[in-house]
């Protein structure tokens, strides 16, 4: 058993049919010795008294708010939570595998430059009794600082028949060197309960594999002419990092129709302008990469041909 | 430590054309380590992350844009900066700050080139004769630190008489082709950054 | 099975003109950028234009404007390529050639022999 | 016009062995390059597009690197069947052009 904050206990447990469970001691948060009773959430059946209360916790029936009173009056709380472990692996029943880039990923993280600042987002399929509370650093074992926001509801989708809820992060590193060699990962750890279970979630990365830049901006077509080419030109984002001669991007233009099976022109730059053929009814767009460390691609800005 | 001194190219820069040939050559060679090493340790999640130029050179420092000299988290470990007169730059420090930053870049590439062709020394003694380093990379490394210019003592190349061992020696590659490839990411800004200034 | 097959070879007169053509098979023949790209005895390609046959629209490289006209026949999925003006430094395989893409090609016709001599 | 150029014309190498030829632009091209085989008698056949991008059904030991001006093909090791004309082609712009092509033979 630990303590993750004030007055909330997570029991880790090896989940099994008849498992022994743990054996826990609950202590009551005051002065008072004599005349103490405890009760478990909103029941008024009386578990036991003193100033201890040992009681063993085998499934969630066990788990919950324990309340200790003296003569109708509340002395403290204690909740527990449980941490099911299944056949040595801890359980990750309340967040979606993400599967992308890999199996069991449920934490995805990505920053638009290098500036330190990151947003971290998860999938969920439950709506109601969730909270998160969401950790992070560079490094572990002498850990430098990066503070996270509160982790807020950033979507939700419907998935056959099924609603789907995206909580998202954003976290920024205290001190921060845009043009730093990362050799220390950052951590990042997420606190998940639902009712009365504990689950913890972690991702480690270097910004470097998380960057994907903004779109390319304020994209502007040139007609070439007597031909059937265009001039298309646009400029870096506002987000990416500067200078931009020291974070440079490559570009990748793409004339294509509606659908992805059309016939397309493509071409790849690392300038701010290229000539491209532009057909009836098709659209330019333009993405961006880091022209030097490979991470993603963002995603496109179009502008249709005509 | 006495840097060599730097007679900059003032028409920078066939050395963004090696730059770039660098970080191809180490990158091509990264992913045929890890596809050719795939039981082993090799990728990026994997190894433990050294850096052999650490307190040795300074090449992020050194070579750090103008721009971002305000930025208080970069000047940290400086030991050089910049800034003088509040961040005001006199041309001849520009000049100097300059020569630094390349002969810093220069050390660095000495430094890895001792490293690999020990290492490759010792490659070419295992039986099972599983990965080699690409000659092309050794050459673009050569190419680079002939097209920065600088006179420095040559840096004996390791020889170790004990028997190697080529499961440590296989990881050691790893680790440090991913080191390579960072610095070689950080000399390519630079290049390109002072290509456009 | 996409395949392109090409007309057969052709003996000119310098001064005259060639209509090579590429019929398409497997696939819808609109979806398809079409290309001619032709190769001298001994040497490398050189790249002469495209045609889009959804439109009709072309591109002809500089040194063949004026001389070479891409044509398309959707109907019979039937690209042509005719070459005016003929010299005996024309003589060369012509080949067809198509992708999704614009600016590479996945696909190659079997090619045509043109051969001008007088 | 843009201009290709290829190294060496001609290659001689022994079966197993690998090979490595390269292409030169006359300008900086990005990753607009892409890579054909010709056997005698046949037509081009696309190996590489995008500079490294592979194709089903081309052999894994085809691949391709290079962005600005210089590009290789490298064959890991050359089979029987590898013996034969190859050829880079730019796509920065048109008109479109090619190598002059680099013969590997049986040495």
């Known amino acids: 058993i630990w303590e993750l904050k004030k007055d909330v206990y997570v029991v880790e447990l090896d989940w099994y049919p008849d498992a022994p469970g743990e054996m826990v001691v609950l202590t009551c948060d005051t002065p008072e010795e004599d005349g103490i009773t405890w009760t478990l959430d909103q029941s008024s059946e009386v578990l036991g008294s003193g100033k201890t209360l040992t009681i063993q916790v085998k499934e969630f029936g066990d788990a919950g708010q324990y309340t200790c009173h003296k003569g109708g009056e509340v002395l403290s709380h204690s909740l527990l939570l449980l941490h099911k472990k299944e056949d040595g692996i801890w359980s990750t029943d309340i967040l979606k595998d993400q599967k992308e880039p890999k199996n069991k990923t449920f934490l995805r993280c990505e920053a638009k430059n290098y500036s330190g600042r990151f947003t971290c987002w998860w999938l969920t399929t439950i709506s109601t009794d969730l909270t998160f509370s969401v950790k992070s650093s560079r490094g572990s074992s002498d850990p430098q600082g990066v503070t996270c926001g509160a982790a807020t509801l950033s979507a939700e989708r419907v998935r056959g028949d099924n609603k789907e809820y995206e909580y998202s992060v954003e976290c920024q590193e205290d001190s921060a060197c845009p043009a730093a060699e990362e050799s220390l990962p950052i951590e990042v750890m997420v606190d998940a309960v639902h009712k009365l279970k504990y689950e913890n979630y972690t991702s480690s990365f270097f910004i470097r594999d998380i960057i994907k830049p903004d779109p390319p901006k304020n994209l502007q077509l040139k007609p070439l002419k007597n031909s059937r080419q265009v001039e298309v030109s646009w400029e870096y984002p506002d987000t990416w990092s500067t200078p931009h001669s020291y974070f440079s991007l490559t570009f990748c233009v793409q004339v294509q129709g509606k659908s992805k099976r059309e016939k397309k022109d493509r071409v790849f730059t690392d300038k701010t302008s290229a000539t491209v053929i532009c057909r009836k009814n098709a659209s330019i767009s333009v993405r961006a990469q880091d022209r030097y460390y490979s991470s993603s691609w963002s995603e496109w800005a179009s502008v249709p041909c005509s | 430590r006495n840097l060599p001194v730097a007679t900059p190219d003032p028409g920078m820069f066939p050395c963004l054309h090696h730059s770039q040939n660098l970080l191809r050559a180490v990158s091509n060679m990264l992913q045929k380590a890890r596809q050719t090493l795939e039981f082993y340790p090799c990728t990026s999640e994997e190894i433990d992350h050294e850096d052999i130029t650490k307190d040795k050179t300074s090449t992020v420092e050194a070579c750090l844009p103008l721009e971002l000299t305000k930025n208080e988290s970069c000047l940290n470990s400086r030991e050089t900066s910049f800034i003088t007169n509040g961040s005001c730059l006199a041309s001849r420090k520009t000049s100097f700050m300059m020569a630094l930053c390349l002969s810093s870049i220069y050390e660095d590439l000495k430094m890895y080139q001792v490293e690999f062709k020990t290492m490759n020394a010792k490659l070419l003694m295992d039986p099972k004769r599983q990965i080699f380093l690409d000659q092309n990379m050794l050459a673009v490394i050569d190419e680079l630190m002939q097209a920065l210019n600088f006179n420095s003592e040559t840096v004996p190349q390791k020889s170790s008489l004990e028997e190697p061992d080529f499961y440590k020696t296989k990881i050691k590659l790893c680790i440090l082709l991913h080191a390579f490839r960072i610095r070689a990411v950080t000399i390519d800004r630079v290049m390109s950054y002072l290509n456009a200034s | 099975q996409v395949q392109l097959v090409q007309s057969g070879a052709e003996v000119k007169k310098p001064g005259s003109s060639v209509k090579v053509s590429c019929k398409a098979s497997?696939?819808?023949?609109?979806?398809?950028?079409l290309h001619w790209v032709r190769q001298a005895p001994g040497q490398g390609a050189e790249w002469m234009g495209w045609?889009?046959?959804?439109?009709?629209?072309?591109e002809y490289a500089p040194k063949f404007q004026g001389r070479v006209t891409i044509t398309a026949d959707e109907s019979t999925s039937t690209a042509y390529m005719e070459l005016s003006s003929l010299r005996s430094e024309d003589t060369a395989v012509y080949y067809c050639?198509?992708?999704?893409?614009?600016?590479?090609?996945?696909?190659w016709g079997q090619g045509t022999l043109v051969t001008v001599s007088s | 016009d843009i201009v290709m150029t290829q190294s060496p014309l001609s290659l001689p190498v022994t079966p197993g062995e690998p090979a490595s030829i390269s292409c030169r632009a006359s300008?900086?091209?990005?990753?607009?390059l892409h890579w054909y085989q010709q056997k005698p008698g046949q037509a081009p056949r696309l190996l590489i597009y995008?500079?490294?991008q592979s194709i089903s059904g081309v052999p894994s030991r085809f691949s391709g690197s290079g962005s600005g001006t210089d590009f290789t093909l490298t064959i890991s090791s050359l089979q029987p069947e590898d013996f034969a004309t190859y050829y880079c082609?730019?796509?920065?712009?048109?008109?479109?052009?090619f190598g002059q092509g680099t013969k590997v033979e049986i040495k």
């Open positions: 050639a198509r992708n999704k893409e614009l600016r590479y090609f996945d696909v």
């Open positions: 497997g696939g819808t023949f609109s979806d398809y950028y």
């Open positions: 045609i889009d046959p959804e439109n009709g629209d072309t």
């Open positions: 300008q900086s091209i990005s990753i607009n």
């Open positions: 995008f500079a490294s």
């Open positions: 082609q730019q796509s920065n712009s048109f008109p479109l052009t």
